[in-house]
């Protein structure tokens, strides 16, 4: 069964800067990745970035840099201030559309006890939805 993992890290140098890493553990070919915050995309969440392997990358503030790390994982750097700034309990979600498995989404947030610059290991997060 495919799984999605989500890792959230607060940067020690910039406390308003977060790095989100997401990966897909499956054998299919990824056709689209959507990163959102505040909940799953389409269920109250706000889209931060969309990554298409053959068309490119689209991102919205406060996303600063979205990129593919491997064929099955992505990273997103967020930075902001005021209303657009992420906070420690913000939930980030990643949705992977893959053929033939379909769409798989998982969410994560900064570990409650984590110090700036630290993060939880990228273990698979609970799968919220599989279309």
């Amino acid at each position: 069964t495919p799984e999605v993992w989500v890792q959230v890290r607060m940067e020690a140098t910039e406390l308003s800067s977060f790095t989100i890493r997401c990966g897909f553990l499956g054998s299919g070919s990824i056709s689209l990745v959507t990163v959102s915050w505040g909940g799953p995309n389409g269920a109250g969440g706000t889209t931060l970035a969309v990554l298409h392997p053959e068309r490119g990358i689209r991102q919205w503030a406060p996303a600063r840099q979205a990129r593919w790390e491997t064929q099955s994982s992505i990273s997103l750097i967020l930075e902001g201030s005021g209303a657009s700034s992420p906070c420690a309990n913000t939930t980030f979600c990643c949705k992977f559309a893959s053929f033939p498995e379909g769409s798989w989404e998982a969410c994560g947030s900064l570990p409650p006890s984590s110090d700036p610059g630290l993060s939880a290991p990228p273990t698979p997060a609970p799968i919220l939805r599989a279309d």
């Epitope: 969309v50 990554l51 298409h52 392997p53 053959e54 068309r55 490119g56 990358i57 689209r58 991102q59 840099q65 990129r67 593919w68 491997t70 064929q71």
Partner: nanobody, 118 residues
Framework: EVQLVESGGGLVQPGGSLRLSCAAS????????MGWYRQAPGKDRELVAT???????KYVDSVKGRFTISRGDAKNSLYLQMNSLRAEDTAVYYC????????????WGQGTMVTVSS
């Protein structure tokens, strides 16, 4: 399918300048890496310069200080300002785009000829 169209090539004297342009058909997504490659007669195609959508730039040593790559205000427009041109810069210049930066799908323009000759 992303289409790339180059323009700006031509005949120029040694020491002269040219500005190449490349327009991409993709207007929703940012293409992660765009670049210029060139192929001189009888030689292999070689990298000239690349730029990511976040502004990270690389040049081949032979053009450093003479060529400047940039991306325009229009999404996925690409430029190459070529100064102090030399005879050895004569080649067909190709625009290249790698939307993911992973090489999963790479697009090429049809090329524009640059001839440096007196």
């Amino acid at each position: 399918e992303v289409q790339l169209v180059e323009s700006g090539g031509g005949l120029v004297q040694p020491g002269g300048s040219l500005r190449l342009s490349c327009a991409a058909s993709e207007t929703y997504f940012d293409l992660y890496v765009m670049g210029w490659y060139r192929q001189a007669p009888g030689k292999d195609r070689e990298l000239v310069a690349t730029i990511t959508y976040t502004g990270s730039i690389k040049y081949v040593d032979s053009v450093k200080g003479r060529f400047t790559i940039s991306r325009g205000d229009a999404k996925n427009s690409l430029y190459l300002q070529m100064n102090s041109l030399r005879a050895e810069d004569t080649a067909v210049y190709y625009c290249n785009a790698d939307p993911s930066g992973l090489g999963r799908k790479v697009y090429w323009g049809q090329g524009t000829m640059v001839t440096v000759s007196s």
